[in-house]
């Protein structure tokens, strides 16, 4: 009984043409869908002049339908039992399932001001980038439409730069008709204990983001993870979107739709400072900002983002420590809204259902020489937008589930 | 093809004044900003005003302050450095360069300013 | 302001030695120093910026290296038309600054 359910999940599980888990590898059966909550920010004049603290009011969600295009390119490798592809990104604005059009206009921090005064930090330079803010009308703050701040539009202050320099800013410019990867995952017919677990991205096993073993990429995509998953396990996967290997942990049993899954959980360990966690003093990449490696539950992922001081956490702050979230006025962080969780069909290691929630944040630093920055007193880690990426199996997926390998096992 | 033209350099006794153009083509010279440098005879560069893009701000070297003044006219697309209670040590060629993230791409030929009795 | 020392203030060299020219800078300037060649009676032209990035159209010959007070121009065969005077500068902060010059002559 047993050692022939576990040969035929060992069989079904490898990622090879014929498969059940290959189908639904190649192009997900789920339908994802990624809320957005924009942080529209209430107070832009009394920051900018007073260095007030900012007073933000959530608004969303704004959900596009995700993870619809199959994998491109995937190609075998029969010699090292590896698949390797590239994962299509693609957005589809759903509006029955949105409090608004992409049209919809937000007071937000600006983008390309806040990324060029951090980035060109010497003097001269500022003097330069005042001149540009001051001539194409910019400030601190901006307004634009949710269309605008996720997917891109011209800056009017890098387009006066007189030489080639790259003038769309967006969140997430580009998105549409590009590709993550390339990924190269063990397809687990040589050692089913290894399958989706990710050998090379982009042709590395190591980021260059980070040092020591926080540059490491480790496990597998969370789509899946090899079979036989037991409580005890902690679960490691790469996650592009925040530049880094995390890992989740066991929190409970959950019923979906008449399957035992376990819910593993992002623990707010992984997010603590090294004082707390010192498995994460390579995440501590400046002593400033993060108060010499002591502030915690954020990430700054600036050397992913070519310079940008883009600064990852969970939504609302939630695991933060206190001086992060002091500036800000208007979150609400809760674990039931605000955390990741995995729920994983422990027999095959498929992600059923899940929720990816992340918040992106920038930094805004003061500058003598840049007019709108003269007056703030204190840096800034400025909430911009919260998302939440969910998963669910289908009614009929889900049957089809229950009948082949669940109910099969009791 | 970028190039920039200075004029108006001659003899000047000292306390006098002089005004020195820079006529620059190939280029907007609003977009970058121009710089004035000058090299006494036999000496090394120094930087003398800057005007930033966009008739941005002028900044001066604290040996020419309150004494020189940089402007441009943009519809001539030339720059101008207004110079007033010259000194004999004021005495060099001067180059007005383009520049924008503060190193000089294209210089002018320079233009000898003599200031003696 | 920030000073930039250059050494040494001249040298003598063959056609094909290697040249080396130093520059100091009096604090940090992180990758924000130029380099010129100067003949006499004529305008500087630029060999290098963000210390290391050759100018579009200079030989290949011409390299720069350094970061933070560091600095150095490196001719790796000297020419017979390299015979000049060199400048670095920094443009990190106003006002920009030169160092005095290498006069680089014939041995």
């Known amino acids: 009984g047993d050692l022939l359910i576990q040969k035929t999940i060992k069989k079904q599980v490898v990622l090879e043409e014929g498969t059940i888990a290959f189908k639904n590898w190649v192009k997900t059966g789920t339908e994802v869908y990624r809320q957005f909550w924009i942080f529209d920010v209430q107070n832009p004049q009394e920051v900018m002049m007073n260095s007030s603290n900012i007073q933000v009011k959530q608004r969303g969600p704004y959900t596009y339908r995700v993870r619809f295009l199959a994998k491109e390119n995937v190609t075998q490798d029969a010699e090292d039992n590896t698949v390797s592809f590239l994962q299509p990104n693609g957005a589809i604005f759903e509006p029955s399932l949105s409090v608004g059009t992409e049209a919809d206009n937000f007071t937000v921090l600006n983008l390309a001001v806040a990324a060029a005064s951090h980035i060109y930090q010497n003097q001269f330079v500022q003097m330069i980038l005042n001149s540009l803010i001051n001539k194409s009308k910019s400030s601190m703050f901006q307004v634009r439409t949710l269309r605008e701040l996720l997917w891109g539009y011209r800056d009017p202050f890098l387009s006066l730069v007189p030489y080639p320099v790259t003038t769309t800013v967006g969140l997430f410019y580009p998105y549409n008709n590009t590709a993550d990867g390339v990924y190269k995952v063990f397809n687990g017919k040589d050692n089913i204990s290894k399958v989706a677990i990710i050998d090379t991205y982009k042709g590395k096993r190591n980021l260059s983001y980070w040092e020591s073993h926080c540059d490491m990429i480790n496990g597998t995509d969370a789509a899946s993870f090899p079979p036989f998953v037991e409580k005890s396990q902690v679960l490691q996967f790469f996650s592009s979107d925040i530049c880094r290997s995390i890992y989740a942990v066991f929190e409970s049993d959950v019923n979906l739709k008449g399957i035992p899954v376990y819910r593993f959980v992002l623990p707010s360990k992984a997010f603590a400072s090294p004082v707390e966690n010192p498995d994460n003093y390579c995440f501590c990449t400046e002593k400033i900002i993060s108060k010499n490696c002591t502030s915690y539950g954020v990430l700054d992922i600036s050397k992913c983002k070519e310079g940008r001081p883009v600064y990852i956490s969970l939504p609302h702050f939630l695991y933060a420590s206190p001086d992060v979230s002091e500036p800000i006025d208007g979150l609400n962080p809760n674990e039931e809204e605000h955390r990741t969780y995995l729920d994983i069909e422990p027999i095959t290691g498929f992600t059923l259902q899940f929720a990816k929630r992340l918040q992106v944040n920038l930094l805004v630093k003061p500058s003598e020489k840049i007019q709108v920055l003269k007056n703030l007193k204190r840096n800034y880690i400025v909430p911009i937008l919260w998302l939440n990426e969910t998963g669910t199996i289908g009614d009929e997926k889900a049957n089809m589930f229950r009948s082949q390998v669940t109910g099969k096992i009791n | 093809e970028v190039q920039l033209v200075e004029s108006g350099g001659g003899l000047v006794q000292p306390g006098g004044s002089l005004r020195l153009s820079c006529a620059a083509s190939?280029?907007?010279?609003?977009?970058?900003?121009i710089h004035w440098v000058r090299q006494a005879p036999g000496k090394g560069l120094e930087w003398v005003a800057w005007?930033?893009?966009?008739?941005?701000?002028?900044y001066y070297a604290d040996s020419v302050k309150g004494r020189f003044t940089i402007s441009a006219d943009t519809s001539k697309n030339t720059a101008y450095l207004q110079m007033n209670s010259l000194r004999a040590e004021d005495t060099a060629v001067y180059y007005c360069?383009?520049?924008?993230?503060?190193?000089?791409?294209?210089w002018g030929q320079g233009t000898l300013v003599t200031v003696s009795s | 302001d920030i000073q930039m020392t250059q050494s040494p203030s001249s040298l003598s060299a063959s056609v094909g030695d290697r040249v080396t020219i130093t520059c100091r800078a009096s604090?940090?300037?992180?990758?924000?120093v130029a380099w010129y060649q100067q003949k006499p009676g004529k305008a500087p032209k630029l060999l290098i910026s963000?210390?290391?990035s050759l100018y579009s159209g200079v030989p290949s010959r011409f390299s720069g290296s350094g970061s933070g007070t560091d600095f150095t121009l490196t001719i790796s065969s000297l020419q017979p038309e390299d015979f000049a005077t060199y400048y670095c500068?920094?443009?990190?902060?106003?006002?920009?600054?030169f160092g005095q010059g290498t006069k680089v002559e014939i041995k």
């Open positions: 360069a383009r520049s924008f993230f503060g190193y000089f791409d294209y």
């Open positions: 190939g280029f907007t010279i609003s977009s970058f900003g």
């Open positions: 005007i930033a893009p966009y008739g941005g701000d002028e």
């Open positions: 604090q940090d300037v992180s990758n924000w």
């Open positions: 963000y210390a290391t």
């Open positions: 500068q920094q443009h990190s902060n106003a006002p920009l600054t």
